[in-house]
């Protein structure tokens, strides 16, 4: 029976150029976590597995950063960034877990945001 | 350029004891995932061993067919990496190939035969 | 016996398109990413495709790699007889702490 639960920044917003940590958090369970998945949309963003460490896509390498912990740093946004993230969770033996984060990269300096995941 | 040279096979009784060295060029072995894998004569690859990157976990990984005999290392100074066989048997004769990576295995070195025999 | 199933051989006509299937369970190919690795003959193996469909650079396009459910698959469009060789597909196992080969299959051009 999975019983954890996924804690996320939920709906954030940033400047463009600026930076953001995407972070989740799997509570209330004592599965395993063997890897979690970045994904933007159907895109792979990164891989984090507890064996073989980071991956980061290619395509991504410029602006993706890992970290902290399982979170994920995104770099000189742009608007294009602007849409769904999900972090998801593999576990054993519970299975897997998603969470979703919205981000909003803003043109103006009037972004508002979640400060504890904000980057200056 | 990205090399891997593999040195230190050769004919060995069972029983007996070998330490193979790989020579690491162009990156550095303790920031990366390392591996052995190893090929018998006419069969497909089977992994040995894998080491992780140092600023990762530092963790060493085996095949149970070699758990307890086997001993993957790495000197840093030397940019080499290690693996030392003991107890070895005749079922351990194989090219012996190590590997850097860790999301698949992206550079290989040329192999070194392993023979067990008496 | 390994827990990942290929057929043993393979052939195909230069400039034909051929695939390879890698066939498992959903403890292992369903819920893990596949790598491929070609080894040319009496040289080795090298990196073909990464998490499931990803190529490194320097891998032409005709090779493409695939996943759906418990089952992968490579597949070689245009076949060369440089193609020739012997493919591996490959998972890490997070559970036995280690990589699981293929029995690999021999792929013959005609």
């Known amino acids: 029976m999975m019983t954890g639960t996924i804690e996320t920044t939920g709906n954030i917003s940033a400047e463009k150029g600026g930076s953001i940590i995407l972070q989740c958090h799997l509570s209330s369970t004592t599965a395993q976590v063997t890897q979690v998945n970045w994904e933007q949309q159907d895109q792979l963003l990164a891989i984090c597995n507890a064996d073989l460490g980071w991956h980061i896509s290619p395509s991504f390498k410029d602006r993706v950063a890992p970290g902290p912990g399982l979170g994920l740093t995104l770099q000189s946004l742009t608007v294009n960034d602007t849409g769904e993230y999900f972090c998801i969770y593999h576990t054993y033996p519970d299975g897997t877990y998603t969470g979703r984060i919205f981000l909003e990269v803003l043109e103006s300096s009037v972004a508002e945001h979640g400060a504890r995941f904000q980057i200056p | 350029e990205v090399q891997l040279l593999e040195s230190g096979g050769g004919l060995v009784q069972p029983g007996g004891s070998l330490r193979l060295s790989c020579a690491a060029s162009?990156?550095?072995?303790?920031?990366?995932?390392m591996s052995w894998v190893r090929q018998a004569p006419g069969k497909g690859l089977e992994w040995v061993s894998t080491?992780?990157?140092?600023?990762?976990?530092?963790?060493?990984y085996y095949a149970d067919s070699v758990k307890g005999r086997f001993t993957i290392s790495r000197d840093n100074s030397k940019n080499t990496l290690y693996l030392q066989m003991n107890s070895l048997r005749a079922e351990d004769t194989a090219v012996y190939y190590c590997?850097?990576?860790?999301?698949?295995?992206?550079?290989w070195g040329q192999g070194t035969t392993v023979t067990v025999s008496s | 016996q390994s827990v990942l199933t290929q057929p043993p051989s393979a052939s195909g006509t230069p400039g034909q398109r051929v695939t390879i299937s890698c066939s498992g369970s959903?403890?292992?190919?369903?819920?893990?990413?596949l790598y491929w690795y070609q080894q040319l003959p009496g040289t080795a193996p090298k990196l073909l495709i990464y998490?499931?469909?990803q190529r490194p650079s320097g891998v032409p396009d005709r090779f493409s790699g695939s996943k759906s459910g418990t089952s992968a698959s490579l597949a070689i469009s245009g076949l060369q007889s440089e193609d020739e060789a012997d493919y591996y597909c490959?998972?890490?196992?997070?559970?036995?702490?280690?990589?699981?080969f293929g029995g690999g299959t021999k792929l013959t051009v005609l």
């Open positions: 080491t992780s990157s140092s600023s990762w976990n530092n963790y060493t």
């Open positions: 998490l499931n469909d």
């Open positions: 490959a998972f890490w196992d997070d559970h036995l702490k280690g990589w699981v």
């Open positions: 959903n403890s292992n190919i369903g819920a893990k990413y």
């Open positions: 162009g990156f550095t072995v303790s920031s990366n995932w």
């Open positions: 590997a850097k990576g860790s999301y698949g295995m992206d550079v």
